[in-house]
């Protein structure tokens, strides 16, 4: 039921610039929808998910990869102001809806040469699990999400 | 199971200030946003606002802006409201209520058990 | 604020009947309509979101349908538990709005 007491993730990164996130699901979500989305006081506002979305517009700067294998990976791209804010993972898995992680995403002013800002996930020991395969489970291609 | 758990009733004067609770249980507390309705007589229902029980941001109601002031104790997974300035037009049994999903939905699937405010000279 | 204008305000009966409400909202809502039933002494319950979805657990003679400004609530089969207070309440913008209640009674 989410990581207890877990604190966000705090992230700072220049307007233009891109940030990638990973996210650890437990390997029985390796077939739940994944989903990126933007905290408000109503809840998490999704913004991408795993599912496959051929309506997804063509300016859009938030991209979500299920790597497999306990991964998720989340691109946000062409930084702008307006992105600050907290973000999270979340699965819809077998235990019901989780949080995986979360970010406080900082935009500072723009930098002289653009860069990605990798992040990790805390969630990573806490969803880690020890009965899993060692090898990676790739997930089919309608599971991973479409630029 | 999810339970939301209201205190009790109160019979308060014109002019004080009074606060609710709503205790919530059977989930992660801190995964959900609450909502506050308030059922009146004159008024059917009203949403009032909700309060983000993890980083306590706030959205209102305009109506109830400098009437009712939403806070959350994380550690003891309970959400609060305080109504000030009291009159006969704020009696009403007040509602928290939760929404059946982490992601942002404003309908409720789970209500507390309502705590009756009655405002009398 | 979205208005939602809810009729009849009162509908008295006769259990097997087949019962019908009306809410229209005074912008466009999308179909992001829910439907309450408040029996007397209780909490609201959910009965329907999203304009048609039956909640869980909820019996299948409680319908929704509608879009954008026009939603109607049925109970193709009323049977004496259906007592009860009926909202049907917007979520698509803030502030978050119900209509002012039918009050069903059987006869």
């Known amino acids: 039921q989410g990581i207890v007491g877990s604190l966000p993730e705090v992230l700072q990164a220049p307007v233009g610039s891109s940030i990638l996130v990973q996210c650890h699901y437990r390997l029985q979500d390796v077939k739940a929808q994944k989903v990126w989305c933007r905290f408000l006081p109503e809840g998490c506002q999704p913004l991408v998910s795993s599912a496959v979305d051929r309506r997804a517009p063509a300016g859009r700067r938030t991209f979500l990869t299920d790597l497999g294998g306990g991964l998720l990976q989340v691109e946000m791209v062409t930084l702008q102001e307006e992105d600050a804010g907290e973000y999270g993972c979340m699965v819809d898995g077998a235990r019901g809806p989780q949080i995986l992680h979360r970010v406080s995403l900082n935009i500072l002013p723009p930098e002289e040469e653009e860069e990605t800002h990798k992040i990790g996930s805390l969630a990573e020991n806490a969803f880690s699990d020890p009965a899993g395969s060692a090898n990676p489970l790739e997930p089919s291609q309608d599971e991973k999400s479409i630029p | 199971q999810v339970q939301l758990e209201q205190s009790g009733a109160e019979l308060v004067r014109p002019g004080v200030s009074v606060k609710i609770s709503c205790k919530g249980s059977g989930y992660t507390f801190t995964d959900y946003s609450m909502h506050w309705v308030k059922q009146s007589h004159a008024k059917s229902l009203e949403w009032i606002g909700v309060i983000s029980t993890y980083y306590g941001d706030v959205r209102y109601n305009q109506k109830f802006k400098g009437k009712a002031t939403m806070t959350v104790d994380k550690s003891s997974s309970t959400a609060y409201m305080a109504l000030a300035r009291l009159t006969s037009e704020d009696s009403a049994i007040y509602y928290c209520?939760?929404?059946?999903?982490?992601?942002?939905?404003?309908?409720?699937?789970?209500w507390g058990q309502g705590t009756l405010v009655t405002v009398s000279a | 604020s979205i208005v939602m204008t809810q009729t009849p305000k009162f509908l008295l009966v006769s259990a097997g009947d087949r019962v019908t409400i009306t809410c229209k909202a005074s912008?466009?809502?999308?179909?992001?309509v829910a439907w309450y039933q408040q029996k007397p002494g209780q909490s609201p319950k959910l009965l329907i979101n999203y304009a048609s979805s039956r909640y869980t657990g909820i019996p299948d003679r409680f319908t929704g349908s509608g879009y954008g400004t026009d939603f109607t609530f049925t109970i193709s089969t009323v049977q004496a538990e259906d007592l009860a207070v009926y909202f049907c309440?917007?979520?698509?913008?803030?502030?978050?709005?119900f209509g002012g209640g039918t009050k069903l009674e059987i006869e």
């Open positions: 209520a939760r929404a059946p999903m982490i992601t942002t939905g404003a309908w409720f699937a789970y």
């Open positions: 912008q466009s809502v999308s179909n992001d």
């Open positions: 309440q917007q979520d698509y913008s803030s502030p978050y709005t």
